[in-house]
Structure formats: structure tokens, C-alpha cells
């Protein structure tokens, strides 16, 4: 007798509850600062319900206001490493379509080895989100240290 | 004429809006790295609507995808203290049932005195979440500095 | 055939989906540690759906439990700057009505130049949220570096 059951005539997807939580697959090749993500129950606790992955980048399928969140931890990193390799910066943005390209969220590591943040932002069907990590330190692929997700909040 | 009123035949609980925000009660005894939480209106702004506390640990009552968030601030801490006592690490994970034990979220303090993060994760009825703080520094019990919560997002 | 359409007899506002995401407008005059916010599509990606701005401070229009989140980045900042100017602290709280005045969320910058956090908290219609930045460093007004928002979660 959960909400979904009370609204049996509507599939969950039609409720607008698009949500995704991704884990890091790999970093980009030279000159490509993007992180490449993966998701799905076979991989552990990551999933995509609505949004899709397009060559490792997250593509939105439903217009609305979304909560976007991210945590990235640098591997083999201490505060000394982080400051020596500064600036290491993470930016989350809309990278396509080009007409909507914009940076949504930006953080520098300074003397820390983890950044974590979240924000509300309007996204449209077809928007692709990219996460750019600039610097010389590698991100950890441990699923409890590095992850990226979105949650549809309202139209 | 809020949503809950429009769906008067359904109590709020059946909508799946389980949510909890907890404040720190105390740390564990020696050899127990867990933080022990408390919640309820009598304590201030903490609350449990759906999930329950089991000996200071948060137990989930409804299957679904949850947004888990936490902030922990170290007491009597400066960046010098934090780096001298490094590594101080916080990990949030499912600690029971043992068959589902997994680390969900992990952060180190490095030269900072506060960590804060959030993530989406599937949780099942009966999952108990533990927050392990390893290191020699004590967390602040101020309710605006240290808190832990979950929010049901979708089935 | 989104949820809003399936519930055509109910306007979105009545669903309780109050949400706001704000960008920094300016800092306060001397002796006023408050940050002054602005929001609206004309300004970029900020918006107010339900809550309102009252002289740059966010006023709540609907009772409920809210997810409050914030990120503040200090301008012209390095880890050395941050530690030299310590303590620089950000606090989010209810500042009016005076009878409900309380600090909800507090973080210090220590050796970092960005703080980001989030928490669940009950808010009532008429509560005004203030964000106080104490210290001598100025916040960045870049919309991807400094923002503040709330999301209604449940009654």
C-alpha cells in the first residue's frame, strides 16, 4: 500500500522520479579531463532509473529541477600531495547540447583529498552532464569514495 | 489542499516518505568506532518518520532508494590538530544484516575539521546503518555541526 | 503523463513541492555578517518556487521538513590564505521570527576555500533563513561556486 500501489494506473516512470547514482569507470584520455561513469545493479549499488549513459556521460531524459550531487576522492593522496599538485579542480556542467553548455558546480581540492557537494538545477531532456577533473592526481574508483548522481525533484 | 490532503485515504507513511535526521548522542566504548545517534522533537530539530533507532544505530523500515547525508565536525580541532591526528576517517555503511554489510560513503578529514557528503543508495527494510569514526579525535555534539540523516526518494 | 498531469485537478504548488536555489547577490554592510541572495530565471539558473526573498534572505511559505543545502567558495583564496584568515565560518540558521532563532548548519573553512553541506530540518511558514559568513575573506559570486537552496521533502 505504498504510493506506487495507490497510483497503480501510473508506472513509476510517469511519476517523474528519475534518479541515477553512478560509479567511476575510468578517466579520459589525454586532453580529455572528463570522468567516465558507469551504473547498474551488476556493478554494485549504482543504478539508472530514467537517465541514461552516453559514452560514460549522464544524459537526462525528463525536464525538471534536479538535485545533482557528487563526491570525488583522489587516490594516493594526502594533504601534502593535494597542496603540491594544486590546483586540482572538479567541475560538473552541461556539456551538450553546446547551446546549453554551462558549469553548474565547481570545487578545488586545495589541501584536501575529497570534495563533495550538491545543488538544485533545472535540466532539460537531452542535457548531458560532464564532470571534468583537472590536475595530475588520479581519482579513486572505490565506490564509497567516488560517485555522482542526480535526483528529479519537481517539474 | 496539499498532496497529503488530496490523497486523504492514504496515511503519509504509505506514501513512502520515510525520513530521519539525527543528532549525535555519544561515541562508542573503546574498540567500538561507531557513533551513537539520537532523534526526536524533545531533543531539538531531530526526528524519525519511518526509520527507527536500534541502540543508537539507524534501522530502515521501507525498501527503496534513499538519499543518505552526513556532517561530522571534530571537537577541539584546528587544521594542525587534524593533520597531526591524521588519518581520521568517517565511513557510513550497512552493518547489519551481516549478509548486506558494505561501506556506502567514506571520507577522511586530512587538514579539515568537518566532513560533509551525501549519496543515493538502495536500502532494504531491516538494513541498519552504522557510522564509524576512526582516529583519536572526538566529534562535536553541537546539533548544527554533527548530524546524520536519510530521506526515502523512490521505490 | 507525468505525475503533475495525472493530478490535473491539483496545481503543482498544492503538491508541496516548494523549492528554491539562490545565487549570491552581495555581502552585508559592516557589522552585518549576512550574505544577501538573489534568484530568478533572468539571473541564470536560480529560481524560487514557493519560498520568497525578503531583503536578500529566504522566507519559507510552507510548513514541512526541508533539505537545506549550501556551498560557499571564498574568492582570491588559497589554503595559505584560508589558514591565515582563520577562523572563517559559515552558519545557516533561522533568523526570524526571533522566537524560532536557531543555528541549523555551521562549518569552518580551516585550510580549505570551499565549504559544502546539506541537512534535513523542519521549517515553518514565515521562517526566514540567514547565512552568516564571519571572517575577513570575501565569498565568490560565481554561480557554480556559491549557492544556497532548499527543497520541501514532506509535511
Amino acid at each position: 500500500q505504498r504510493f506506487a500501489q495507490a497510483q497503480q494506473q501510473l508506472p513509476l516512470e510517469s511519476l517523474g522520479w528519475d534518479v541515477a547514482e553512478l560509479q567511476l569507470n575510468h578517466t579520459g584520455p589525454q586532453q580529455d579531463p572528463r570522468l567516465y561513469w558507469q551504473g547498474g545493479p551488476a556493478l554494485g549499488r549504482s543504478f539508472l532509473h530514467g537517465p541514461e549513459l552516453d559514452k560514460g556521460q549522464l544524459r537526462i531524459h525528463r525536464d525538471g529541477i534536479y538535485m545533482v550531487h557528487i563526491q570525488v576522492t583522489l587516490a594516493i593522496c594526502s594533504s601534502t600531495t593535494a597542496s603540491r599538485h594544486h590546483p586540482t579542480t572538479l567541475a560538473v556542467g552541461i556539456c551538450s547540447p553546446a547551446s546549453r553548455s554551462i558549469s553548474l558546480l565547481r570545487l578545488s581540492f586545495h589541501q584536501g583529498c575529497t570534495i563533495a557537494s550538491q545543488r538544485l538545477t533545472p535540466l532539460a531532456r537531452g542535457d548531458t552532464l560532464c564532470t571534468n577533473l583537472t590536475g595530475t592526481l588520479l581519482p579513486s574508483r572505490n565506490t564509497d569514495e567516488t560517485f555522482f548522481g542526480v535526483q528529479w525533484v519537481r517539474p | 489542499q496539499r498532496f497529503a490532503q488530496a490523497q486523504q485515504q492514504l496515511p503519509l507513511e504509505s506514501l513512502g516518505w520515510d525520513v530521519a535526521e539525527l543528532q549525535l548522542n555519544h561515541t562508542g566504548p573503546q574498540q567500538d568506532p561507531r557513533l551513537y545517534w539520537q532523534g526526536g522533537p524533545a531533543l531539538g530539530r531531530s526526528f524519525l518518520h519511518g526509520p527507527e533507532l536500534d541502540k543508537g544505530q539507524l534501522r530502515i523500515h521501507r525498501d527503496g532508494i534513499y538519499m543518505v547525508h552526513i556532517q561530522v565536525t571534530l571537537a577541539i580541532c584546528s587544521s594542525t590538530t587534524a593533520s597531526r591526528h591524521h588519518p581520521t576517517t568517517l565511513a557510513v555503511g550497512i552493518c547489519s544484516p551481516a549478509s548486506r554489510s558494505i561501506s556506502l560513503l567514506r571520507l577522511s578529514f586530512h587538514q579539515g575539521c568537518t566532513i560533509a557528503s551525501q549519496r543515493l543508495t538502495p536500502l532494504a527494510r531491516g538494513d541498519t546503518l552504522c557510522t564509524n569514526l576512526t582516529g583519536t579525535l572526538l566529534p562535536s555534539r553541537n546539533t548544527d555541526e554533527t548530524f546524520f540523516g536519510v530521506q526515502w526518494v523512490r521505490p | 503523463q507525468r505525475f503533475a498531469q495525472a493530478q490535473q485537478q491539483l496545481p503543482l504548488e498544492s503538491l508541496g513541492w516548494d523549492v528554491a536555489e539562490l545565487q549570491l547577490n552581495h555581502t552585508g554592510p559592516q557589522q552585518d555578517p549576512r550574505l544577501y541572495w538573489q534568484g530568478g530565471p533572468a539571473l541564470g539558473r536560480s529560481f524560487l518556487h514557493g519560498p520568497e526573498l525578503d531583503k536578500g534572505q529566504l522566507r519559507i511559505h510552507r510548513d514541512g521538513i526541508y533539505m537545506v543545502h549550501i556551498q560557499v567558495t571564498l574568492a582570491i583564496c588559497s589554503s595559505t590564505t584560508a589558514s591565515r584568515h582563520h577562523p572563517t565560518t559559515l552558519a545557516v540558521g533561522i533568523c526570524s521570527p526571533a522566537s524560532r532563532s536557531i543555528s541549523l548548519l555551521r562549518l569552518s573553512f580551516h585550510q580549505g576555500c570551499t565549504i559544502a553541506s546539506q541537512r534535513l530540518t523542519p521549517l515553518a511558514r514565515g521562517d526566514t533563513l540567514c547565512t552568516n559568513l564571519t571572517g575577513t575573506l570575501l565569498p565568490s559570486r560565481n554561480t557554480d561556486e556559491t549557492f544556497f537552496g532548499v527543497q520541501w521533502v514532506r509535511p
Epitope: G28, D32, P33, C77, H85, L133, T136 | P87 | -
Partner: antibody
């Protein structure tokens, strides 16, 4: 079976250049970060450089920064180390090593090594 | 940089002996400590990772312990094939650094 096979070592004059290669097989090369580690004759191990799985992120020991360049070609399952401005102290056996996938950054597999001699 | 100090630099032991090698980090490295075995003319081989986890295929007579700054590699009953040089390595921060090595020789 995981195999790493280094090549390209040899004798070079001080100030000269050399390019080492490491051919990988038996695993999905493009999923792993890789490093070069060297060992001077009769001495201990010294980490030289690391490269991320897709090659976009690199890091170096201070002793080789600005002189050595690590790179990879995932289509050829090959890791490279371009060594310029070689010095006498660069004389060593150079090993390529695979990093464990979990990013704990231990070396779970090593090549057999290739000797670089810098002498006039 | 994090300095790794191994002791002893060499030791003589007999087959069947219990052997202990210690490694100390110049700062706390949590459990990011790994142990390798190297035989003359060969590449190093991973024995222990994350301070105490035994690498697949490594005999159970090898064990590791410790956290923070002090770590130990123990060989419970030395076998003829164990005579080699052993290195510790920290994977806590770059630059990745190794200990100077401990040579285990036949008594």
C-alpha cells in the same frame, strides 16, 4: 595469465634519450592504471611515474619531472616511458607494474624489467 | 615525501625459523602499506597489501600487521624458497615510496 614485457633499454650517453615500452597481455589493459618503477644496481626500488587507465592523468617523481614522459596506447595494450636528458643516476632496471583495480595503488603484477645504462 | 624505514637491513635465519621484519612510516599512513618479495635478477612479487591482506596465491605462512606508522611482515616458518629481499611500500600518497629492503639470508 597477466603478462608485462618491457623493452627498449640499452646504453645511452648522458643527455641522450630512450623510449621504453611495456607490452601487456592477459587482462583488460584499458581498465588499469600503470606505473614505472626503477631499481639502480644493488639498490632499492624507486617509483618513477604513474598514468591513469585512459592516459589523461599522469604523475612523476621529482627526480624525473620535466625529463620523463609516461604515456600509453590502449589500442596496442602498450605502456611507454620517454626518457630525455638522461643522467648517470638514471641507470637502473626499469619495471612496468600494474596497479590494483581498487585504487589502493599497490603493484599486483610486474614485468621482468629492462636495463638502462647511462654512460659516456 | 613519506619516508619508509625498514629494519633490519639484513638477517640470517634457518629453515623453520619465525622471521619478523618491521617497517616504519615517517607519518601515519593508515593501512596503506604493502609488502613485496624480490629474488636476485627477478621482478618484485606482491605478498601483502593493505597491511594485512594476503595476495592470492601467496602461502599462508606470510602475514602482515600494523596500522598508522608501524608495520610488521611475519614469516611463520621460513622455507628455502623464502630467502630473498623484502620491501615495504606505502600507497597512501604520492610519491609512492619503498623501504630500503631487508635481505633474508641462510644462516
Amino acid at each position: 595469465e597477466v603478462q608485462l614485457l618491457e623493452s627498449g633499454g640499452g646504453l645511452v650517453q648522458p643527455g641522450g634519450s630512450l623510449r621504453l615500452s611495456c607490452a601487456a597481455s592477459g587482462f583488460t589493459f584499458s581498465s588499469y592504471a600503470m606505473s614505472w618503477v626503477r631499481q639502480a644496481p644493488g639498490k632499492g626500488l624507486e617509483w618513477v611515474s604513474v598514468i591513469s587507465d585512459s592516459g589523461g592523468i599522469t604523475d612523476y617523481a621529482d627526480s624525473v619531472k620535466g625529463r620523463f614522459t609516461i604515456s600509453r596506447d590502449n589500442s596496442k595494450n602498450t605502456l611507454y616511458l620517454q626518457m630525455n636528458s638522461l643522467r648517470a643516476e638514471d641507470r637502473a632496471v626499469y619495471y612496468c607494474a600494474r596497479h590494483d583495480y581498487s585504487n589502493r595503488y599497490y603493484f599486483d603484477y610486474w614485468g621482468q624489467g629492462t636495463l638502462v645504462t647511462v654512460s659516456s | 615525501d613519506i619516508q619508509m624505514t625498514q629494519s633490519p637491513s639484513s638477517l640470517s635465519a634457518s629453515v623453520g625459523d619465525r622471521v619478523t621484519i618491521t617497517c616504519r612510516a615517517s607519518q601515519s599512513i593508515s593501512s596503506y602499506l604493502n609488502w613485496y618479495q624480490q629474488k636476485p635478477g627477478k621482478a618484485p612479487k606482491l605478498l601483502i597489501y593493505a597491511a594485512s591482506s594476503l595476495q592470492s596465491g601467496v602461502p599462508s605462512r606470510f602475514s602482515g600487521s600494523g596500522s598508522g606508522t608501524d608495520f610488521t611482515l611475519t614469516i611463520s616458518s621460513l622455507q628455502p624458497e623464502d630467502f630473498a629481499t623484502y620491501y615495504c611500500q606505502q600507497s597512501y600518497s604520492t610519491p609512492l615510496t619503498f623501504g630500503g629492503g631487508t635481505k633474508v639470508e641462510i644462516k
